[in-house]
């Protein structure tokens, strides 16, 4: 019962070396590297800025996911395909996508870190459907939601009139509404005796915090590395690091609070500590001051207590989706928090300097978050649909959430 | 108020080199971009580089050819331009000018504010 | 590299005149095109960023409005202080460029 599905030992490795061979191929044709005279000193900062984004989605998104018993080394190693694939195909389809007509794609510093966030989107989205698919449908995911993004970016550019680059800030609600909606999608009931592959063990949990750790640590840079101003900068890693610093006062304390006996769930924590920082993702160079950021991190931190105790229930009932990630539940509320915020710091900004474009500005905002969520849904949809095919050879649902499907152990040890 | 002062020999013999620096007082140059422009005699405006006041990042037009070199002091709040191999056709104003801040237009790629502060420009002649 | 073309190259107005000076991008900028007044023996100085954002200071007779690839700046009534050439420059992506500028002299 633990041999891999035919579909595992045959397809993937076929379709995963076509599909980096036609990469190769398009790199060979279509991309070269900046030929710009970068200063030296310039160019270290730039990578070290990339660097963190790295860290954050190979290792703070990989073990952020592997909470599950029976499911950690699927969770950080697909996490870190995706990844791979992800960038790759991102880079292109930026390149294409940002000039027109198509020409030659420029490789820069900026180019790989604008494409290690599109490829972090799936991660957030894989959150909410790893452990029920297989690699290969994985890999339609990524190629699916990296497309699907980049469309999005370009529609909002051309309809809204703002810089391709900067649409991104969506990206947040973007994943947590697509990966929800793959989930939907996906084969829903769990029979009886596969409960215990998705129970959570000490272990993993205390990966899973250390995953939430590595993205604590560098979320800042993941908040302001599109901005140009310097000032901004400086406001968004500010900011990004008050609200960080409450949301996990707040997590834990609140953790505590949720629980009849005033215990702290470990599940709880290492989704809230993260709160803050996807609370003013969007808004974070907007903010005048830390006090506001403060507030947004303890009102997120008590969102994502309330939504850890309730949103999986409601998914489950509600939906008919299960076993989702809390973290990525969680980003579906918070990103929405965001957003609002957002377009609450532009009302008062544009009020402040006597700008009377207000409500243009309001309509250009919401419509812009409507439209990505949106095309979350519909590419979402789609993906989900695509991923229920009989030839990627899904994994049955009573091997949902389990490793030995993908993995060649040693010896099977028991109680694994 | 911000202000700009370029400083730097104003007279250079061809295939030299020439450096300039800018004074910045009224404004930290770690909180903006800085840009150099030059104007050749009775010609228009041409953009050298640019550098980010808070990291080392800089961007220079290729028309340079790899001549250019933009710097940055913080302690002393100023800018530098080094231009090598210089000929004749390099003879022109050069300004030192501060790109402004749109909250709304926040992006690495692209600057939604123009610049907003010019020095008052340096003649450098290239002569020998 | 993207070439901004201005026109016309000079023009010549009565005092109260509704001035207009065009700015073509060979590509599509968005709205990153900023206006700028030279007087001679000056530096340039902003007038207009973001297309159409007055900058602070700037008499409100001036306005500017384009999109994407055509940009116009406007002088609703020409002053004497409005000699000046006039310069359009784009920001989107580097090297930013300056359009040839146009000469506004008063009849």
């Known amino acids: 019962s633990s041999k891999y599905p035919r579909s595992v030992r045959r397809c993937l490795p076929l379709w995963a070396l076509t599909l980096e061979a036609a990469l190769i191929l398009l790199f060979y044709f279509f991309t070269h590297y900046d030929a710009s005279l970068e200063d030296q000193k310039g160019l270290v900062a730039s990578y070290q800025v990339g660097q963190d984004l790295t860290v954050m989605a190979a290792l703070g998104l990989g073990f952020l996911t592997s909470n599950f018993r029976r499911h950690s080394w699927s969770s950080v190693a697909f996490n870190l395909f995706m990844l791979a694939l992800g960038v790759q195909w991102a880079i292109l389809l930026d390149g294409f996508l940002s000039q027109f007509p198509p020409g030659k794609v420029v490789i820069t510093l900026f180019s790989i870190r604008l494409a290690t966030m599109s490829a972090m989107s799936v991660l957030i989205s894989a959150g909410a459907v790893l452990g029920k698919v297989n690699l290969a449908q994985l890999v339609v995911m990524v190629l699916v939601e990296v497309t699907a993004l980049g469309t999005l970016r370009m529609v909002i550019s051309n309809i809204f009139n703002t810089d391709y680059h900067m649409n991104l800030r969506h990206f947040y609600v973007f994943a947590a509404y697509f990966g929800l909606t793959v989930a939907w999608c996906l084969p829903k009931p769990l029979p009886k005796g596969t409960e215990d592959n998705d129970q959570r063990a000490t272990i993993p949990s205390l990966s899973a915090m250390l995953g939430a750790l590595f993205l604590w640590m560098f979320w800042p840079s993941v908040n302001s590395p599109l901005l140009r101003s310097p000032i901004q900068r400086k406001n968004a890693m500010f900011n990004t690091y008050y609200a960080l610093a409450v949301s996990v006062v707040t997590a834990i304390s609140g953790s505590s609070l949720a629980h009849p006996q005033r215990k702290i769930s470990m599940t709880y924590v290492h989704s809230a500590v993260l709160a803050g920082g996807v609370a003013v993702g969007t808004s974070c160079h907007l903010i005048p001051s830390p006090w506001l950021a403060m507030v947004l991190g303890l009102v997120a931190g008590l969102i994502s207590i309330g939504g850890a105790k309730c949103l999986p229930v409601c998914c489950n009932r509600v939906l008919g989706i299960h076993h989702i990630s809390v973290m990525h539940s969680i980003f579906s509320l918070l990103g929405l928090l965001g957003e609002i915020t957002y377009i609450v710091l532009l009302v008062l900004h544009t009020v402040w300097n006597g700008n009377g474009m207000i409500g243009f500005q309001v309509l250009l905002s919401i419509g812009e978050l409507s439209l990505a969520i949106v095309i979350a849904l519909t590419s979402g949809l789609l993906t989900g649909l695509l991923l229920n095919l009989k030839i990627w050879k899904a994994p049955h649902v009573a091997k949902y959430f389990d490793d030995q499907v993908f993995w060649k152990f040693p010896h099977l040890a028991v109680g694994f | 108020e911000v202000q700009l002062l370029e400083s730097g020999p104003g007279l250079v013999k061809p295939s030299e080199t020439l450096s300039l620096t800018c004074g910045v007082s009224g404004a930290s140059i770690s909180n903006y971009w800085w840009s150099w422009i030059r104007q050749s005699p009775g010609k228009g405006l041409e953009w050298i580089g640019e550098i980010d006041g808070s990291t080392y990042s800089t961007h220079y037009n290729p028309s340079l050819k790899g001549r250019v070199t933009i710097s940055k002091d913080a302690s002393k709040n100023q800018l530098s331009l080094r231009l090598t191999s210089v000929t004749a056709a390099d003879t022109a104003v050069y300004y030192c000018?501060?790109?402004?801040?749109?909250?709304?237009?926040?992006?690495?790629?692209?600057?939604?504010?123009?610049?907003?502060?010019w020095g008052r420009g340096l003649v450098v002649s290239v002569s020998s | 590299e993207l070439q901004m073309t201005q026109s016309p190259s000079s023009l010549s107005a009565s005092l109260g005149d509704r001035v207009t000076i065009t700015c073509r991008a060979s590509?599509?900028?968005?709205?990153?095109l900023h206006w700028y007044q030279q007087k001679p023996g000056k530096a340039p100085k902003l007038l207009i960023y973001a297309a159409s954002t007055l900058q602070s200071g700037v008499p409100s007779r001036f306005s500017g409005s384009g999109s994407g690839t055509d940009f116009t700046l406007t002088i609703s009534s020409l002053q004497p202080e409005d000699v000046a050439t006039y310069y359009c420059?784009?920001?989107?992506?580097?090297?930013?460029?300056f359009g040839g500028g146009t000469k506004v002299e008063i009849k």
């Open positions: 590509e599509n900028v968005n709205n990153y």
């Open positions: 420059q784009h920001s989107y992506g580097t090297p930013l460029t």
């Open positions: 000018a501060r790109e402004g801040q749109d909250p709304l237009a926040p992006t690495l790629a692209t600057s939604g504010s123009g610049l907003d502060s």
